[in-house]
C-alpha cells in the first residue's frame, strides 16, 4: 500500500500561523490523502515532542435522518411515535447543523466520513504538550462557534486579547460566513493522571448558546491523552480500534431550527401547538451518535483490543448506566459490565473483542431504550493481511491517522 | 370565505395525461399544504399524499408513487394533479383539500376523472 | 399503514333519534381522529378533530369521544339534513387513513 502523503510545515510557513509555533520543537502537521490506505495495519504509535494539529473545521446546515436503517416503523411500540410523520409530528428527519471537517483552508473538500460517527464531529486527539489550531469556519445561517470542554489553554491564534466585549472566548460567537482560528494548548492539567486511563475523554461543541447550539447537532469528540502514552505491556500502543460513542438525547423543541423543520415537514405551521406534550415528546430523540432505534450499526474485529470513548451529553438530566451486551470491559483498571455516565461527562474503556455475533449497546434506563438509545455491535472474523510495513513509520501515522478520524485495524 | 374550486370533469383515453386543478382563495396560500384525496366509484376515500405549499416538496402515498405527480403555482393559490399514463383504475373523483394540523379542514368539490377507451 | 374499522357500514334511523357510529384503529393514535361528513353536491364537511373537538361552525348535537384504538361519533336529536355518509380518518401520522363510511339513510 501507499504511503500516507504527510507534509511537515517548515518553520517559514508556520509563522503564518503564530509565533509561537517557530519552536524547532514544534511539528506543524497537515494532511493530504488523495492515495491514502483504506486501512492501516499497525498498534504502537507515540511521539518524541510535541505536535500542532491544524484542523479545519465546518458549521454546516443539512438534514439529518436519525432513523436511515429503519425502513418502516412497526405499529406496535414506540418507533413509529418518533419515527413517522404526521400532520403535527416531524418524524424522522430534522435539519440540523454538524461540525464538518475539511481538508485546507479553502474549505472545499471534505474529509472522509464514517457513518458510524453519525452526528458527531471530526475527532479531535491531543497529548499533553501538543496543540491544536483550529480553523473554524461558520458555514451555518446563525452564530455559533467551537470551543472544547477540557482543555483549559484556548485563546485566538492571532492575538493574546480577546474580541473586544467578551469576557471569555467560549462566549465569542463567529457570525455566518466567518472564519475564526483557535489555538487550544493541552496542558499537563488537562491530561490524565496516573489513576486514569490513557486518554480522557472529553468534547467540543459551541457555546454561544450552549444548549440551544448542541440540540441543533454541534457536539464532536476530544481526547486528551498522555504524553507517550503506553499501553499496559510498556508498548507505546494505541489499540486495534477506537470507538466514539455520543449517548445523547436531542431536545428538538430546543433547536434553532424548531421553526424551519415545522414549516418543512408539517402541513399548517401556524396550527402547531408547541406546548402540546405529544408534539413535543415527539421531538426529542434518544439516540446514539445520532442515530436511534439500531440504525447505528457497529463493526468490530474478533480478537482485537477495542477502546470506546463514551459520552453522556444532551437533554438527559439523570445518569446513564451503559452496557455492551455479551462484554465486559475495563475501566479505571477494573472490569464492569455497566458504565455510569454522569450528564456532560465522558469515560473511557478497552475490551477485548473475544465474542462473535451481533451484540446490543444500550442503557439500562428502559425508557430510553423503548425510544430509540440502542445500536448493535457486530463482532466477527476480519481477514486482513498482516505486515508491518508501517512499523518504522510510527510518528508520521500517527498524525495521519489521528487527523483523520480513521479506524486503526487490527493486524 | 375559504373556498376551493376544482377544474372540471375530464374523459380521457388510457395513456393519456391529466392535469386537475384547485384554486384557493379566502387564507394565505403558503400557510396550508394541500392534500389530495381519490374517490373510486362506489368506494371510500383514499389518501393520496399532500404537497407543503410553503416549501413545494411532495409527499406521496405508496399506492401514488410514479405516475402522480402535486404542483403548485403560488402566485395563482393554486395547486395540481397531474397523473400520466392514465390507466381505467385511475377513474374516480379526484378531491383537493387543505391540510390543517390537525385535519383536512376544507374541500374542493371534486373532478371527475373518467379513463375509457 | 393505521387500519381503521368503521362500523356499521349502514343504519337508518328517523329525526328526532340518537345515533351512534364507531371507529377502531389498528393500534394507538391518542386522540389524533377526525369525523367528516358527505352529501352529495356539498363538499366535505369537518366535523369532529382530535377524537372530541368540534369544528367551528358545527351544530353541538355532532360529539365525538375516545382515545387509543376506540373513537364513536354521536348524532343526538338527528334533524333531516344529517342523513349522509360518514366517514372517519386518523390524523395521527402519514399515511392518513380513513374509514370505509357509514350511511346513514331515513328509516
Known amino acids: 500500500p501507499e504511503e500516507p502523503q504527510l507534509r511537515m510545515k517548515n518553520n517559514e510557513e508556520a509563522e503564518d500561523y503564530d509565533d509561537d509555533l517557530t519552536d524547532s520543537e514544534m511539528d506543524v502537521v497537515r494532511f493530504d490523502d488523495d492515495n491514502s490506505p483504506s486501512f492501516i495495519q499497525i498498534r504502537s504509535v507515540a511521539k518524541k515532542h510535541p505536535k500542532t494539529w491544524v484542523h479545519y473545521i465546518a458549521a454546516e446546515e443539512e438534514d439529518w435522518d436519525y432513523a436511515p436503517l429503519v425502513l418502516a416503523p412497526d405499529d406496535r411500540s414506540y418507533k413509529s411515535q418518533y419515527l413517522n410523520n404526521g400532520p403535527q409530528r416531524i418524524g424522522r428527519k430534522y435539519k440540523k447543523v454538524r461540525f464538518m471537517a475539511y481538508t485546507d483552508e479553502t474549505f472545499k473538500t471534505r474529509e472522509a466520513i464514517q457513518h458510524e460517527s453519525g452526528i458527531l464531529g471530526p475527532l479531535l486527539y491531543g497529548e499533553v504538550g501538543d496543540t491544536l489550531l483550529i480553523i473554524f469556519k461558520n458555514q451555518a445561517s446563525r452564530p455559533y462557534n467551537i470551543y472544547p470542554h477540557g482543555i483549559t489553554d484556548v485563546r485566538p491564534l492571532y492575538s493574546r486579547r480577546l474580541p473586544k466585549g467578551v469576557k471569555h472566548l467560549k462566549d465569542f460567537p463567529i457570525l455566518p460566513g466567518e472564519i475564526f482560528k483557535y489555538k487550544w494548548t493541552v496542558t499537563v492539567e488537562d491530561g490524565p493522571t496516573k489513576s486514569d486511563p490513557r486518554c480522557l475523554t472529553r468534547y467540543y461543541s459551541s457555546f454561544v448558546n450552549m444548549e440551544r447550539d448542541l440540540a441543533s447537532g454541534l457536539i464532536g469528540p476530544l481526547l486528551i491523552c498522555y504524553k507517550e502514552s503506553v499501553d499496559q505491556r510498556g508498548n507505546q500502543i494505541m489499540s486495534d480500534k477506537r470507538n466514539v460513542i455520543l449517548f445523547s438525547v436531542f431536545d428538538e423543541n430546543r433547536s434553532w431550527y424548531l421553526t424551519e423543520n415545522i414549516q418543512r415537514f408539517l402541513p399548517n405551521p401556524a396550527g402547531v401547538q408547541l406546548e402540546d406534550p405529544e408534539f413535543q415528546a415527539s421531538n426529542i430523540m434518544h439516540s446514539i451518535n445520532g442515530y436511534v432505534f439500531d440504525s447505528l450499526q457497529l463493526s468490530v474485529c474478533l480478537h482485537e483490543v477495542a477502546y470506546w470513548y463514551i459520552l453522556s451529553i444532551g437533554a438527559q438530566t439523570d445518569f446513564l448506566s451503559v452496557f455492551f451486551s455479551g462484554y465486559t470491559f475495563k475501566h479505571k483498571m477494573v472490569y464492569e459490565d455497566t458504565l455510569t455516565l454522569f450528564p456532560f461527562s465522558g469515560e473511557t474503556v478497552f475490551m477485548s473483542m473475544e465474542n462473535p455475533g451481533l451484540w446490543i449497546l444500550g442503557c439500562h434506563n428502559s425508557d430510553f431504550r423503548n425510544r430509540g438509545m440502542t445500536a448493535l455491535l457486530k463482532v466477527s472474523s476480519c481477514d486482513k493481511n498482516t505486515g508491518d510495513y508501517y512499523e518504522d513509520s510510527y510518528e508520521d501515522i500517527s498524525a495521519y491517522l489521528l487527523s483523520k478520524n480513521n479506524a486503526i485495524e487490527p493486524r | 370565505q375559504i373556498q376551493f374550486v376544482q377544474s372540471g370533469p375530464e374523459l380521457k383515453k388510457p395513456g393519456e395525461t391529466v392535469k386537475i386543478s384547485c384554486k384557493a382563495s379566502g387564507y394565505t396560500f403558503t400557510n396550508y399544504g394541500m392534500n389530495w384525496v381519490k374517490q373510486a366509484p362506489g368506494k371510500g376515500l383514499k389518501w393520496m399524499g399532500w404537497i407543503n405549499s410553503y416549501t413545494g416538496e411532495p409527499t406521496y402515498a405508496d399506492d401514488f408513487k410514479g405516475r402522480f405527480a402535486f404542483s403548485l403555482e403560488t402566485s395563482a393559490s393554486t395547486a395540481y394533479l397531474q397523473i400520466n399514463n392514465l390507466k381505467n383504475e385511475d377513474t374516480a373523483t379526484y378531491f383537493c383539500a387543505r391540510g390543517a394540523s390537525y385535519a383536512m379542514d376544507y374541500w374542493g368539490q371534486g373532478t371527475s376523472v373518467t379513463v375509457s377507451s | 399503514d393505521v387500519q381503521i374499522t368503521q362500523s356499521p357500514s349502514y343504519l337508518a334511523a328517523s329525526p328526532g333519534e340518537t345515533i351512534t357510529i364507531n371507529c377502531r384503529a389498528s393500534k394507538s393514535i391518542s386522540k389524533y381522529l377526525a369525523w367528516y361528513q358527505e352529501k352529495p353536491v356539498k363538499t366535505n364537511k369537518l366535523l369532529i378533530y382530535?377524537?372530541?373537538t368540534l369544528q367551528s361552525g358545527i351544530p353541538s348535537r355532532f360529539s365525538g369521544s375516545g382515545s387509543g384504538t376506540d373513537f364513536t361519533l354521536t348524532i343526538s336529536s338527528l334533524e333531516p339534513e344529517d342523513f349522509a355518509m360518514y366517514y372517519c380518518?386518523?390524523?395521527?401520522?402519514?399515511?392518513?387513513?380513513f374509514g370505509a363510511g357509514t350511511k346513514l339513510e331515513l328509516k
Open positions: 382530535s377524537g372530541s
Open positions: 380518518q386518523q390524523h395521527y401520522e402519514y399515511p392518513l387513513t
